[in-house]
């Protein structure tokens, strides 16, 4: 077609090949590129930079080849608009470096960088690791040192070559509802670029005030609530080697609380409960006012919670085979250093076979049961019984 003689020729239904020498200095606004999956560029000495918006609109792109061209800079966010990119060939260009951020978030199956004057520096440690660990098909020549020719420098042994070290300092004292909490994020490392807090989990748990800058960032949590418990406060930092982040959780103390539900028959009987408090409260059951000693017939069983970001725990007082001797008043006492709470519920599992009308015949096969016992049984179940 006539258009092919200009700059780029279509290849199949979703490919584009741009090989006419010296006709491209940018990839921005390639015509008909909407459903492009393959782009091949060659012999474009004026194509020197690949910037953030250059590949906008190429959301379906799977394979990008830019070879034997003048590419000397690829922006860290150059592939932001091509998340499906899996094959990247930038061989035989003028690249001296390539940021780890450029390929972050991509699922590359192969990356070819051979024929570039890559300079050995901390910024290429990620690439060396990819090669060593076979993380994807990485093809480069030996990295060039500042000295003579092609030489491979063991970057990993260079102690100054590493991701930042991030530490968060927290208050040692216990934190209570309504307190203000100051956290400090200390960052160490070479060529630090940026750092910040990630506070997405904290919305509604406190007012947040950021302060300071690299290498020490401050965060004040004002008027904290108990909802802050189990929420991650994260500090991250980046340099040319990579990114590091660390998370902490602020423990906000508050008194125990407890709620009981009516006994329900599941595969066994369950008196459902919910307890809250920080630190996690200790629990004690009482039956008709006396301490209930747990056995494999009557015991506390916590429910596995999918929510790991809350302090409230749910569970059952599990009763296997309860009979009339288990009928009565059940009380759950929850206590922590900040307070205690109790809740009670009446439960009836079975009628007492010994409450009979004087007119009725006496059931001879029955003998008296110790009515003080709390470890007697219950009711058939259909599932595995602890």
């Amino acid at each position: 077609a006539a258009s092919c003689r200009e700059t780029c020729c279509p290849v199949g239904p979703s490919g584009l090949r741009c090989t006419r020498a010296g006709t491209l200095n940018t990839l921005r606004g390639l015509r008909g590129a909407g459903n492009l999956t393959e782009l091949y560029v060659e012999n474009q000495r004026d194509l020197q930079r690949l910037e953030f918006e250059d590949l906008q609109g190429l959301g379906e792109l799977r394979s990008l080849t830019i070879v034997k061209s003048g590419l000397r800079f690829v922006a860290p966010d150059a592939f932001h608009f091509t998340p499906r990119l899996s094959h990247l060939n930038l061989s035989s260009n003028a690249l001296e470096s390539l940021s780890w951020k450029t390929v972050q978030g991509l699922s590359l199956q192969d990356l070819t960088l051979s024929g570039n004057p890559l300079h050995c520096s901390c910024a290429l440690l990620w690439l060396q690791r990819w090669e060593q660990e076979d993380l994807c098909g990485v093809y480069t020549q030996k990295l060039q040192g500042s000295g003579s020719g092609d030489q491979f420098l063991p970057l990993g042994h260079n102690n100054s070559c590493g991701v930042p070290s991030v530490k968060i300092q927290m208050p040692n004292d216990s934190v209570e509802v309504g307190d203000d909490v100051f956290l400090q994020c200390q960052v160490e490392g070479q060529a630090l670029q940026q750092a910040d807090w990630i506070l997405t989990e904290l919305e509604g748990t406190a007012t947040m005030k950021k302060s300071g800058d690299l290498p020490s960032l401050g965060l004040t949590l004002v008027n904290v609530t108990s909802d802050l418990n189990k929420k991650n406060v994260t500090c991250w930092a980046e340099n040319d080697v990579g990114r590091a982040e660390v998370s902490v959780q602020v423990s906000v103390s508050f008194p125990a609380s407890v709620h009981l539900g009516k006994a329900v028959e599941q595969h066994h009987w369950c008196i459902p409960f919910s307890v809250d408090g920080q630190p996690a409260p200790s629990l004690r059951w009482f039956f008709n006012g006396s301490v209930l000693n747990e056995t494999s017939f009557i015991f506390t069983q916590f429910l596995e919670s999918a929510l790991t970001n809350e302090t409230m725990r749910h569970g059952c007082l599990r009763l296997n085979q309860p009979t009339h001797v288990n009928n009565g008043n059940y009380t759950l006492l929850a206590a922590n250093p900040y307070g205690q709470a109790a809740a009670s519920i009446m439960a009836a599992f079975m009628d007492n076979p010994f409450e009979f009308n004087p007119e009725d015949p006496i059931p001879v096969s029955f003998s008296p049961v110790d009515t003080n016992s709390t470890s007697r049984d219950p009711v058939e179940k259909k599932d595995e019984t602890p």
């Epitope: 494999s296 003998s367 008296p368 019984t385």
Partner: antibody, heavy 118, light 107 residues
Framework: QVQLQQPGAELVKPGASVKLSCKAS????????MHWVKQRPGQGLEWIGE????????NYDEKFKTKATLTIDKSSRTAYIQLSSLTSEDSAVYYC???????????WGQGTLVTVSA | DIQMTQSPASLSATVGETVTITCRAS??????VAWYQQKQGKSPQLLVH???TLAEGVPSRFSGSGSGTQFSLKINGLHPEDFGSYYC?????????FGAGTKLELK
């Protein structure tokens, strides 16, 4: 499938102690109490006690309160019974067992034969 | 503690015969009885729980009955593999107790 693995045998001297293991697999270890049962050669079965792997809570038959100590290692999914001050009366097979669908022992270990001999 | 009194202590029978083993509890235990079979040098195997419910995989020639304090295990038409020891056990709270056992031998 549910498995309770126990070593085959232990030879111990009178007055010594021994710690027997029972490694569980094939079910949620912390959800089911582990029980221990003793059987002397040619004799019947005696329930020693039970332990809740979730919190280490134990109950013993009165007869074994000073003889046996039940413990749990959650990380290795293993239950233990320690028998102290051993005498010839303690020579027996010791089984670990757990309930199945109902409150009855549907699953047993192979048992460990403890022989107390000078 | 609940005592479980099992009888007979031993029993001789032939293949094809029907036998019954009984167990008496020292107090009302509703239907909370289990029965086990044990072969020489092996672990016990659950046959029956809740007095009459057969455990998974147990042949239908085994049957349990009773409630309150009187319980029995019946084997209808003995097979060669049925010989061994049998134990009853209450599962009505702790401490759990077993009967002394019945040794079923080939006549």
């Amino acid at each position: 499938q549910v498995q309770l693995q126990q070593p085959g045998a232990e030879l111990v001297k009178p007055g010594a102690s021994v710690k027997l293991s029972c490694k569980a697999s094939g079910y949620t270890f912390t959800s089911y109490w582990m029980h221990w049962v003793k059987q002397r050669p040619g004799q019947g079965l005696e329930w020693i006690g039970e332990i809740n792997p979730n919190n280490g809570l134990t109950n013993y038959d009165e007869k074994f309160k000073t003889k046996a100590t039940l413990t749990i290692d959650k990380s290795s999914r293993t239950a233990y019974i320690q028998l102290s001050s051993l005498t010839s009366e303690d020579s027996a097979v010791y089984y670990c067992a757990k309930y199945g669908n109902y409150v009855a022992f549907a699953f047993w270990g192979q048992g460990t034969l403890v022989t107390v001999s000078a | 503690d609940i005592q479980m009194t099992q009888s007979p202590a031993s029993l001789s029978a032939t293949v094809g015969e029907t036998v019954t083993i009984t167990c008496r509890a020292s107090e009302n235990i509703y239907s909370y009885v289990a029965w086990y079979q044990q072969k020489q040098g092996k672990s016990p195997q659950l046959l029956v729980h809740n007095a009459k419910t057969l455990a998974e995989g147990v042949p239908s020639r085994f049957s349990g009955s009773g409630s309150g304090t009187q319980f029995s295990l019946k084997i209808n038409g003995l097979h060669p593999e049925d010989f061994g020891s049998y134990y009853c056990q209450h599962h009505y709270g702790i401490p759990l107790t077993f009967g002394a056992g019945t040794k079923l031998e080939l006549k």
